[in-house]
């Protein structure tokens, strides 16, 4: 069965600036990755950037810099002032989107005990 | 403007074969994911098999499997169903479908559809 | 397969009336449902992508809510041209599973 990692990073050098680290593990090829925070995108979450492998990238603030990885896993840098920059406790999540296969989701946020700059 | 065409329907015996053709227009074919979806006389929608954009993955309903075959030529713009050893309920009109990946694999565009008629 | 159930089969309205379509799906869909209108001798059209979403022509009086497993399609103000065949679908597992269909008929 597919499954979905989520990692969060709080950066070392901007305290309130997130980094959200994704892959798909699974065989099929991916048609789009969906990123949300403050729950799933069909839960009341918030979409901050979807990724297609061939049609591009698009990206909303507090989104700053969303890319492929590798061809099964994506990084997305948020801004990290402002009144909607996220917050220590703040839920991300990942949707991975595979035709025919199907979707898959999961969701991570930044451990209490993390330190800026450990990965989560 | 997006058009999806079908051709190949017709009355077959049991036992018989068909190929359905769906001819399309307005839009990169190549990148968009495809489907066969039937409606038997006065019933639902049913999918049929889908393929994937990049050839790569297919899908067939279990009632079809070994009988069916999805191909697509993007050079050609076309999406192709071969059917062999019809039964009598697969009676039905055949329609080809488009999948949008940013609609959540909705399918956005629908051919005519082509009536499939096993009888003997 | 996930099992994506309509109710009721029928309805038997008069325009001008606002109607609420059920689905439900027999496990969790997250966003992925769309729903579609089919009128006789017509293939289907869609309506609604992404539970909400109308898609490009669809008058406003078309919406879609819903989360998780129980979604509903409502036309605020029924027209003489929205009488037709209803049914939903999900797109988050394969396969790709239809409702049966609701149908809304002038009474």
């Known amino acids: 069965t597919p499954e979905v990692w989520v990692q969060v990073r709080m950066e070392a050098t901007e305290l309130s600036s997130f980094t959200i680290r994704c892959g798909f593990l699974g065989s099929g090829s991916i048609s789009l990755v969906t990123v949300s925070w403050g729950g799933p995108n069909g839960a009341g979450g918030t979409t901050l950037a979807v990724l297609h492998p061939e049609r591009g990238i698009r990206q909303w603030a507090p989104a700053r810099q969303a890319r492929w990885e590798t061809q099964s896993s994506i990084s997305l840098i948020l801004e990290g002032s402002g009144a909607s920059s996220p917050c220590a406790n703040t839920t991300f999540c990942c949707k991975f989107a595979s035709f025919p296969e199907g979707s898959w989701e999961a969701c991570g946020s930044l451990p209490p005990s993390s330190d800026p700059g450990l990965s989560a | 403007e997006v058009q999806l065409v079908e051709s190949g329907g017709g009355l077959v015996k049991p036992g018989g074969s068909l190929r359905l053709s769906c001819a399309a227009s307005g839009f990169t074919f190549s990148s968009y994911h495809m489907s066969w979806v039937r409606q038997a006389p006065g019933k639902g929608l049913e999918l049929v098999s889908a393929?994937?954009?990049?050839?790569?993955?297919?899908y067939y309903l279990d009632t079809v499997k070994g009988r069916f075959t999805i191909s697509r030529d993007n050079a050609k713009n076309s999406l192709y169903l071969q059917m062999n050893s019809l039964r009598a309920e697969d009676t039905a009109v055949y329609y080809c479908?488009?999948?949008?990946?940013?609609?959540?694999?909705?399918?956005?565009?629908w051919g005519q559809g082509t009536l499939v008629t096993v009888s003997s | 397969e996930i099992v994506m159930t309509q109710s009721p089969p029928t309805l038997s309205l008069s325009p001008g009336e606002r109607v609420t379509l059920s689905c439900k799906a027999s496990q969790s869909v997250s966003n992925d449902v769309a729903w579609y209108q089919q009128k006789p001798g017509q293939a289907p059209r869609l309506l609604i992508y992404y539970v909400s979403n109308r898609f490009t022509g669809i008058p406003a009086r078309f919406s879609g809510s819903g989360s998780g497993t129980d979604f509903t399609l409502t036309i605020s103000s029924l027209q003489p041209e929205d009488f037709a065949v209803y049914f939903c679908q999900q797109a988050y597992r394969s396969p790709w599973t239809f409702g049966q269909g609701t149908k809304l008929e002038i009474k």
């Open positions: 393929i994937n954009s990049n050839v790569i993955s297919t």
């Open positions: 479908a488009r999948h949008e990946d940013y609609y959540g694999f909705a399918m956005d565009y």
